[in-house]
């Protein structure tokens, strides 16, 4: 129920992350499970737990089989099992269906390929990319951040591609490879300079003092899934993760939904308890894209309790 | 977006059984976690009564022990409170929850019970 | 069962001051490198809300401005600075072993 499967080639580096996460700061033991024996801390061995993950460093074919974690609790103990097996590297040049991470598709309006599992080791950029053994070049490969980006997608583009990358462990570097395919979708989609529709440009959003409020920005971009397409908030011109106050939150991660064809997204602008001093405050809901940014601009103002009169 | 929602008469009689239920919606109950009840009494404190795991396993504070019973309905994606021979001192707000590890990190909103005759 | 006692009962503080609630337990609730004493907040009509985890870790979502230290068996819940939507019933539990159980309550007002 609780299990997950985990692979890597000899010699390189291969993270795995328990699946019954619990909290951050809760202990998390790991054994080898056939033989019930625990796995150590010390960071001096090659294989070594490391709270919620467990680190080969490098990994070895004899490595192979199911690690249990518990995550412990006086009351409430969590078990997961992870499914661990290291292959023997190939000397030609495919990639075998088990080493295959999930196939994503992409068009040509959008095509990120992202490296599988590189969230969970320690890189620095950029990746290097592979597709069929080659090394990318040219300048419609992009390494950009976690992913690919190919411009001006072809048909031609589908197949299998490689993420290479160093995990560094303590100053040690190990290679870490991830192989995935990609589909190219015909996809008639186009893009076009951002609509924002809501709010409307100075808008003036009437709310409680006291009350909670909302705002959300919500703008479309074109038709078909987009390609670096963004909505935001700011605070007097400043992103509101830098702003400083706990209370005005963007909701995490953006919307998408598809209105009348268009590719729209959406983001949420919570304030908690609004406060006189927020009505002083510029609320501006910013989308962008590759052709430009748009910004539409609301301001705050305290509602009036209604009268009630007999 | 994990909810939960406490159901069930807001009166029952002395010597009777209150029958709660909590309909949890977003989650399934038996994939994960533990499902708890906890009572308070009108302007008084919070006070565990129990729960049962995703596994089947029941916990119970052993000061209702004897009077309470935690089941689950799998095909409603519910789970109940059974609570017998009841008496004046029952008398609370009654809520569902869900226990991650240690802690109640999922509430229901909570439901009245009046123990009068 | 581990008794939970909470001080004061309640207090009254002004916005932009520090607020200090104690909980102390009749025996330990550290074992293993971790305390498992818990906070939660409860506004009037309203259940409760975790605040901090295993005494120390805000739980995801609660602002900064509370805190929580301690360990064995007095634990400390601070808010620094208090503002005016922090008046509700702060409650402390642990979960050491069962039963679970919470300790009698503080109600926080705000002068």
């Known amino acids: 129920k609780f299990s997950k499967q985990s692979w890597g080639l000899e010699n390189e580096a291969l993270i795995v992350r328990c699946p019954r996460q619990g909290k951050p700061s809760y202990t998390v033991d790991w054994y080898y499970s056939q033989t019930n024996k625990s796995i150590p801390t010390q960071e001096r061995n090659r294989v070594f737990a490391s709270g919620q993950l467990l680190k080969f460093l490098p990994a070895a074919v004899a490595d192979s089989g199911i690690y249990t974690c518990i995550v412990r609790s006086p009351t409430f103990n969590r078990t997961g099992y992870a499914n661990v097996t290291i292959y023997k590297k190939q000397s030609d040049c495919n990639v075998p269906d088990y080493l295959m991470y999930s196939t994503v598709s992409g068009s040509e309006k959008n095509s990120k390929i992202y490296c599988p599992t590189i969230d969970l080791y320690n890189w620095t950029a950029p990746l290097e990319w592979f597709k069929n053994c080659q090394a990318l070049q040219g300048s419609r490969y992009r390494a950009h951040k976690s992913f690919l980006v190919i411009d001006n997608v072809m048909t031609e583009d589908a197949g299998d591609y490689t993420c290479k990358f160093i995990h560094n462990e303590n100053g040690a570097n190990y290679s870490v490879t991830a192989t995935r395919s990609f589909t190219v979708k015909d996809e008639q989609g186009f893009s076009l300079f951002p609509v924002i529709g809501a709010p409307a440009q100075n808008e003036i959003k009437e709310v409680e003092i006291g009350k909670n409020a909302n705002l959300t920005c919500s703008a479309c971009f074109g038709k078909g899934t987009q390609f670096l397409a963004a909505v935001l908030w700011q605070l007097n011109g400043t992103k509101i993760t830098d702003f400083g106050e706990p209370r005005i939150q963007q909701e995490e991660g953006q919307n998408q939904s598809f209105s009348n064809g268009l590719a729209c997204l959406d983001m949420v602008l919570r304030i908690a308890d609004v406060k006189e001093e927020d009505l002083l405050l510029q609320y501006d809901c910013l989308a962008l894209n590759l052709h430009g940014l748009r910004r539409h601009t609301v301001r705050l103002s305290r509602k009036n309790p209604i009268d009630h009169h007999s | 977006q994990v909810q939960l929602q406490e159901s069930g008469p807001g009166l029952v009689k002395p010597s009777q059984t209150l029958s709660l239920t909590c309909t949890v919606s977003?989650?399934?109950?038996?994939?994960?976690?533990?499902w708890d009840w906890i009572r308070q009494p009108p302007g008084k404190g919070l006070e565990w009564i129990g729960y049962?795991?995703?596994?089947?396993?029941?916990y119970y504070n052993p000061s209702l022990k004897s009077r309470v019973t935690i089941s689950v309905d799998t095909s409603k994606n519910q789970f109940s409170l059974k609570l017998s021979s009841v008496t004046a001192a029952d008398t609370a707000v009654y809520y569902c929850?869900?226990?991650?590890?240690?802690?109640?990190?999922?509430w229901g909103q909570g439901t009245l019970v009046t123990v009068s005759s | 069962d581990i008794v939970l006692t909470q001080s004061p009962a309640s207090l009254a503080v002004s916005p932009g001051q520090r607020a200090t609630i104690t909980c102390r337990a009749s025996?330990?609730?550290?074992?293993?490198?971790?305390?498992?004493m818990h906070w939660y907040q409860q506004k009037p009509g309203q259940p409760p809300k975790l605040l901090i985890y295993?005494?120390?870790n805000l739980e995801s979502g609660v602002p900064a401005r509370f805190s929580g230290s301690g360990s064995g068996t007095d634990f400390t819940l601070t808010i620094n600075p208090v503002e005016a939507n922090d008046a509700a019933n702060y409650y402390c539990q642990h979960s050491r072993e069962f039963p679970l159980t919470f300790g009698q309550g503080t109600k926080l007002e705000i002068k």
């Open positions: 977003g989650y399934s109950i038996t994939s994960d976690y533990a």
């Open positions: 049962i795991r995703y596994s089947g396993d029941t």
């Open positions: 025996k330990s609730v550290s074992t293993s490198g971790n305390s498992y």
């Open positions: 295993l005494a120390s």
């Open positions: 929850a869900r226990t991650m590890m240690d802690t109640m990190d999922y």
